[in-house]
Every structure is written in structure tokens, then in C-alpha cells.
């Protein structure tokens, strides 16, 4: 099938890089200059992905391959293949449509991006704050209260966990 | 064409603020960061913040924080740089940039600060 | 913070000559790497981005090379308008930072 597919179609032996063009017989000619066919075959290049404004050229584009995008330093990607460049913030904020807020206490955040999340509640695994919470961190659970030595106490629990995504305004 | 138009600087006194201004035409105002940049006297260049009107998105060089905020007026397609408490120290030419992908593409002419009593 | 260095301060050379300028990054910027001249009126251009990639209207006898930390910028055939000051610039990290600058004199 494969060789009688050539042989009725001389477009089949166009490889990746090249176009078969109708204009001169169906000769394979090679991509235009900010073009690329993946495949074999094609009867047209497709036009390279233009890294413009908040995005960054992460590959380059060839004959063969489209250009690939990120996000310029200070904003990371969001959709598949990079559709939209959103800014970051720093750890311990979320973005809100006002720009960059604090996480409120009870919530954290340990990236650039994303929500503010609530603290572990410790006391539902049964077991006591290590370590407090902060903006940026997690509180760390230890043993349960029973586990600790007569006269240890465990620092306070904290405040009960909200939904998260709200931030002062 | 793409243009960017700086003005507002001066001669100004120490302890002072002064607002810069950076007009753009020539392109879609909010696909674009707005850079500023300082160029001391026969020295290099300091990279001060940028303003995004896509987002509101604004960034500061650490170094300039305390002494830099910028804003920006959409419907005039302007870029606002306001620097504080005024020493010798911030005297120097003013530019603002067009941000593209990862490099300054295009350059106001630069406005000419002078901090002095 | 990245700091871009450029050894040479000043640069004398003859109309006609293949000049070079170097950068040194404090670290690898991933090709991320520009370069722009100032002309002695102040005015400031874009000439080369992406270590190698000419900016639209910038004459071909300006090119660019070099990966990781070091990188260059090369006239090949001096005219006497390429009298400025050349500065490398890295976008690979916030805070952009910029090399100190290379003066380029006839002789």
C-alpha cells in the first residue's frame, strides 16, 4: 500500500522540512524562512510560533520543529504549551485581580504561583504543632499530645482552616 | 513605528520627588512590558522595574524599591516613574524600554535628572 | 544577581578592522544574552538578541556568539558610524543586569 500511495502521490516523499508545491510539479521544496513541516507529506509549512512581549523563546524554531515558548523571567506559563504567561508572586502571596497579597493567617503559600493554602490541622491526625505556620510554610505535626513526655506541651494549634483562595484586600 | 517619548526631569532639589513620564505609540500599549533604566554619568546601565499594562503587573529591581514606584495611565498609553527623597546620587539619565521576549527592543531618548540645591 | 562583566572599558581600532567585544556572565544564561550600542548622542538600539539573532534593521557586519558564560560581539568591517559604547545585557534571571560598557574609538 505504502508504495503504490508514492507512487500515485508524489507528495508521500516530501520529508519533514520540505513542502510539496503544486506550483512547480510537486517538487519537495524546503520550508520558507519562519516555517516547518513536522511530518512528510505536507503540502504546506506551517508558520513558526512567534515568542512575542511576555514570552521567551525556550526552543527555537526549525525546519522540522515549531518554536517553543516560556514566560520572561518575573511570570511563569499557564495552558497547555505556554498559551498564557501570568506574573509571579513571591512565596507567602497569591495573585488576586488587585496583584500580589499576602497570604491571611492560617494560609501559606511556598511557591510563586498559585493559591494560598491552609495550614495542616494537626489535631485531626491527633497529633500536636511542632513547628508553627508561617506565609510561606506549612506547620509541621508532631507525636500526639498523649506521646509527649509528662510536663512537655505542644505549641498552640492553629486557627481553623478556611477555603482556600481569599486574601485580604 | 514604535516610539517611546521620556520628559519630566530636570533640575530638582534634594529631598524632592519628581514623576517621569514615558509616552508609547506605534504599538498595542498592552502587549508590552515598560522598562526603566538608569545610566549615570559615563557609567553603565541599572536595570530600575517595569510596569506591564497587560496585568498591572509591576516589578522592582531590589536596589530601587525604597526609591522607585511606577504607574501607568492606559488611555494615554503612559509609563510613569516617580522617584523619592532625591539625593546627588539619583542624578542621571532616565530611559524607558520596550520589553520583548527577553531584551529591550526599543528605546526612549532619555530624560536628563540633575539633583542639586 | 548576575553580574555581566566586560574586561575591556575602551576599544581603539582602524576603519575596515574585524573588532570583538566580550561579556562574561557571573553564571550559565542559557544563550539569553543581548547586546546594544549607544551612540554618543545618548541614543541606545537593540543590535543583537539571543546571543546571535540580528534585530531587524541592523547591518550584517554585526554579529554575535558565544554560550554559557562567555559570549562576544563582532564588527567585521568597522565604519565610522559604529563609533559608540556597546553594552551586553542577560535576560536569563531577574534582576536584568547590564555589562559596564565597551567604548569603541577610531584610530
Known amino acids: 500500500f505504502e508504495r503504490t500511495r508514492s507512487l500515485q502521490d508524489p507528495c508521500s516523499n516530501c520529508p519533514a522540512g520540505t513542502f510539496c508545491d503544486n506550483n512547480r510539479n510537486q517538487i519537495c521544496s524546503p520550508c520558507p524562512p519562519n516555517s516547518f513541516s513536522s511530518a512528510g507529506g505536507q503540502r504546506t509549512c506551517d508558520i513558526c510560533r512567534q515568542c512575542k512581549g511576555v514570552f521567551r523563546t525556550r526552543k527555537e524554531c526549525s525546519s522540522t520543529s515549531n518554536a517553543e515558548c516560556d514566560c520572561t523571567p518575573g511570570f511563569h506559563c499557564l495552558g497547555a504549551g505556554c498559551s498564557m504567561c501570568e506574573q509571579d508572586c513571591k512565596q507567602g502571596q497569591e495573585l488576586t485581580k488587585k496583584g500580589c497579597k499576602d497570604c491571611c493567617f492560617g494560609t501559606f503559600n511556598d511557591q510563586k504561583r498559585g493559591i494560598c493554602r491552609p495550614w495542616t490541622n494537626c489535631s485531626l491526625d491527633g497529633k500536636s504543632v511542632l513547628v508553627n505556620g508561617t506565609k510561606e510554610r506549612d506547620v509541621v505535626c508532631g507525636p500526639s499530645p498523649a506521646d509527649l513526655s509528662p510536663g512537655a506541651s505542644s505549641v498552640t494549634p492553629p486557627a481553623p482552616a478556611r477555603e482556600p483562595g481569599h486574601s485580604p484586600q | 513605528q514604535v516610539q517611546l517619548q521620556e520628559s519630566g526631569a530636570g533640575l530638582v532639589k534634594p529631598g524632592a520627588s519628581v514623576k517621569l513620564s514615558c509616552k508609547a505609540s506605534?504599538?498595542?500599549?498592552?502587549?508590552?512590558?515598560i522598562h526603566w533604566v538608569k545610566q549615570r554619568s559615563g557609567q553603565g546601565l541599572e536595570w530600575i522595574g517595569w510596569?506591564?499594562?497587560?496585568?498591572?503587573?509591576?516589578k522592582y529591581n531590589e536596589k530601587f524599591k525604597d526609591k522607585a514606584t511606577l504607574t501607568a495611565d492606559k488611555s494615554s498609553r503612559t509609563v510613569y516613574l516617580e522617584l523619592s527623597r532625591l539625593t546627588s546620587e539619583d542624578s542621571a539619565v532616565y530611559f524607558c524600554?520596550?520589553?520583548?521576549?527577553?531584551?529591550?527592543?526599543?528605546w526612549g531618548q532619555g530624560t536628563t535628572l540633575t539633583v542639586s540645591s | 544577581d548576575i553580574q555581566m562583566t566586560q574586561t575591556t572599558s575602551s576599544l581603539s581600532a582602524s576603519l575596515g578592522d574585524r573588532v570583538s567585544i566580550s561579556c562574561r556572565a557571573s553564571?550559565?544564561?542559557?544563550?539569553?544574552l543581548n547586546w546594544y550600542q549607544q551612540k554618543p548622542d545618548g541614543t541606545v538600539k537593540l543590535l543583537i538578541y539571543?546571543?546571535?539573532r540580528l534585530h531587524s534593521g541592523v547591518p550584517s557586519r554585526f554579529s554575535g556568539s558565544g554560550s554559557g558564560t562567555d559570549y562576544s560581539l563582532t564588527i567585521s568591517n568597522l565604519e565610522q558610524e559604529d563609533i559608540a559604547t556597546y553594552f551586553c545585557?542577560?535576560?536569563?534571571?531577574?534582576?536584568?543586569?547590564f555589562g559596564g560598557g565597551t567604548k569603541l574609538e577610531i584610530k
Open positions: 510596569f506591564y499594562p497587560g496585568s498591572g503587573s509591576i
Open positions: 545585557q542577560q535576560g536569563n534571571t531577574l534582576p536584568w543586569t
Open positions: 539571543y546571543t546571535s
Open positions: 506605534g504599538y498595542t500599549f498592552t502587549e508590552y512590558i
Open positions: 524600554a520596550r520589553h520583548d521576549n527577553q531584551y529591550f527592543d526599543y
Open positions: 553564571q550559565d544564561i542559557s544563550n539569553y
